[in-house]
């Protein structure tokens, strides 16, 4: 049935679905912090601009009784229950902001019109690439993915003169939802990943992947996983590593490696961090003074979502256009906006811009140091530290086949 | 297109310090590092240091170090260059511009005429 | 980091080919790809014309072409024209992440 937006005559409402199942444990509350204070942002932006305006965000709750995993398990059903909340209600806002798993968008955006635009703090897997009317405000597979081809290819920085062509990576199926896609993106055979890799081998077993730290016979020195150092820990403990192995540990949204007072741990010697580039202190920000420095990302998407729908309203008031019009719903990518932190690009597609990094440990200060940036916007890496206190010979990452001479 | 603009001249004393602005107008100031270089009078150019403006990471010329900081204002995409103790050999024109690729400025401001002069 | 050795000046007829040298050692030219090449006009803002040893940047003429054997890097114009008339600068990375420049290079076209 047709369901009436509320969006017009001065009065713009946003649609919050507030989903149990979602990419991340964040009490619902924190997130509705995270509205509240972008709503207040938004009015002030409007006001400023002359723009005389209501904006309010109606949150909707599924029930919670059937779907309670907590985790992205039942979050299709529970966010086709939601859309049918809606749809009952008859009553939608001019932009639907939610769901985060990547299993409730997929099936929520092939069952919805494409009349109003849908914002994710999450829906990481490739499955929610290219879609027309959906943006995401957390790194997709995809630039993971972009960075790591990018990344083995690289052979003309002072430390890292080999192409790579090879990779292992580790996936035992506990991982977090963000991990889960991303490594989902790496293992799938026909992702832009798998096509660039002469050889590529998935690790199921904690076994497998202690097995190759030392096998003499193994296919590639380099070894991908997704999580924190704990969780490296928990499978690697302090067993021997040979000295030619680069592990790259995925962990993007944890700003705790570039903490004053941090000291990498004797495990982290032969790893190298991916993660993101810090955002400025939201320490003193009301939203987020509950928040794990590892939670913050998903509850500022949120606040930034908002921010984002405050900006493309100011855009289309300021040009006198229809705000419940295809138009309005396609038009949330390729742009700049002001974000909580500072400036956020979205891609053609809708997906955050971000500028990754990687980190390595220093042997001399036992202190993770930035080796070198990489901007997804524009696909490319700017090495940082061209002269790194590597573990590694000659402070050079090793080639990813042993015994292979200059490539 | 990324520019960077940059104030025309400033007049100092010996003695004094000189604090050079560099705001990218047209973009932000990305995960490149901003380079400062100077030129004095008829002179080549001479390397003093960079930042990576996303991390607030620096690395000074060892000519330099101890009297120059650089440092980046993310929300306001502008990086500044302060040099102290300035004597009379200071005078120049300070360029501030982007690395696109180390040791590789492909966008340049227009520079800034510091005159240190009693 | 001491500046990088160049000829003071040289110079060429229109049509002509000159090659200006930049001369390091294996700490900075020798060591790295991350070799570049400026032109300056007079009062006016350096110019990029090649990075990593021999890449233009989109918009530079193919007139200009980088090589590098050993220590010594090479700024080649070829055709020379008037408007080629500048100071000319190398630059190369210098180990523990400094940069240096040359010592400039003028050119006249005769």
């Known amino acids: 049935s047709q369901v009436s937006q509320n969006c017009h005559n001065g009065s713009y409402e946003i649609s919050v679905l507030m989903m149990g199942n979602s990419a991340f444990a964040e009490p619902l509350k924190n997130l509705e912090d995270a509205v509240n204070e972008g709503l207040e942002i938004v009015r002030g932006r409007l006001q400023n601009a002359g723009l005389n305006v209501t904006v309010n965000a109606t949150f909707m709750y599924s029930d919670g009784l059937i779907h309670n995993s907590g985790d992205c398990r039942s979050s299709t059903c529970e966010g086709l229950d939601l859309l049918r909340k809606i749809s009952n209600a008859q009553r939608m806002g001019c932009v639907l902001i939610g769901p985060s798993c990547t299993y409730s968008t997929f099936q929520m955006y092939l069952d919805t019109e494409l009349s109003y635009p849908m914002i994710s703090a999450g829906s990481f897997g490739l499955s929610c690439d290219y879609k027309e009317t959906l943006t995401r405000l957390m790194s997709p597979a995809r630039k993971l993915m972009y960075f790591l081809v990018n990344f083995w290819k690289t052979n003309d920085l002072p430390f890292k003169t080999y192409s790579w062509s090879t990779s292992y990576v580790y996936k035992n199926g506990t991982e977090t939802e963000d991990c889960f896609w991303y490594l989902n993106a790496l293992e799938a055979s026909v992702s832009y990943f798998s096509h660039e890799l002469g050889f590529k081998v998935v690790l199921r077993q904690d076994k497998e992947f202690q097995d190759i730290l030392m096998d003499h016979n193994r296919k590639s020195n380099v070894i991908i996983m997704c999580g924190g150092p704990e969780f490296l820990y928990k499978l690697k403990g302090d067993r021997a590593v040979a000295e030619d192995i680069v592990i790259i540990l995925v962990d993007l949204f944890n700003d705790q490696y570039f903490e004053d007072n941090v000291t990498a741990p004797d495990y982290m010697k032969n790893v190298l961090v991916l993660t993101l580039s810090p955002g400025n202190s939201l320490l003193n920000s009301s939203f987020s003074r509950n928040l794990s420095p590892t939670k913050r990302d998903f509850a500022l998407a949120y606040l930034n979502g908002i921010l984002l729908f405050g900006h493309m309203l100011k855009i289309f008031l300021e040009n006198g256009e229809n705000i419940t019009t295809p138009k309005f719903a396609h038009a949330f990518r390729n742009l700049t906006f002001e974000g909580y932190d500072g400036p956020v690009t979205l891609d053609d597609w809708g997906d955050v811009d971000s500028t990754m990094v990687l980190l390595y440990t220093s042997v001399d200060t036992k202190k993770y140091k930035v080796l070198l940036t990489y901007d997804t916007h524009v696909n490319k890496t700017y090495p940082v530290d061209m002269s790194p206190t590597f573990t590694w010979k000659n402070s050079k990452l090793p080639n990813d086949i042993t015994g292979r001479g200059p490539q | 297109e990324v520019q960077l603009v940059q104030p025309g001249a400033e007049v100092k004393k010996p003695g004094s310090s000189v604090k050079v602005s560099c705001k990218a107008s047209g973009g932000t100031l990305s995960s490149y590092a901003i380079s400062w270089v100077r030129q004095a009078p008829g002179q080549g150019l001479e390397w003093m240091g960079r930042?990576?403006?996303?991390?607030?990471?620096?690395n000074y010329a060892q000519k330099f170090q101890g009297r120059v900081t650089i440092t980046a204002d993310k929300s306001t995409s502008t990086a500044y260059m302060e040099l102290s103790s300035l004597r009379s050999e200071d005078t120049a024109v300070y360029f501030c511009?982007?690395?696109?690729?180390?040791?590789?400025?492909?966008?340049w401001g227009q520079g800034t005429l510091v005159t240190v002069s009693s | 980091q001491s500046e990088l050795t160049q000829p003071a000046s040289v110079s060429g007829s229109p049509g002509q080919s000159i090659t200006i040298s930049c001369t390091g050692t294996?700490?900075?030219?020798?060591?790295?790809?991350?070799v570049s090449w400026y032109q300056q006009h007079p009062g006016k803002v350096p110019k990029l014309m090649i990075h990593d040893v021999s890449h233009r940047p989109s918009g530079v003429s193919n007139r200009f072409s980088g090589s590098r054997s050993g220590n010594t890097a090479s700024l080649t114009i070829s055709g020379l024209q008037a408007e080629d008339e500048a100071d000319y600068f190398c630059s190369s990375y210098a180990g523990s992440n400094n940069y240096v420049f040359g010592t400039g290079t003028k050119v006249t076209v005769l």
């Open positions: 294996s700490s900075d030219v020798g060591g790295y790809i991350y």
């Open positions: 930042i990576i403006p996303i991390l607030g990471i620096t």
């Open positions: 511009a982007r690395d696109q690729r180390p040791a590789s400025m492909d966008v």
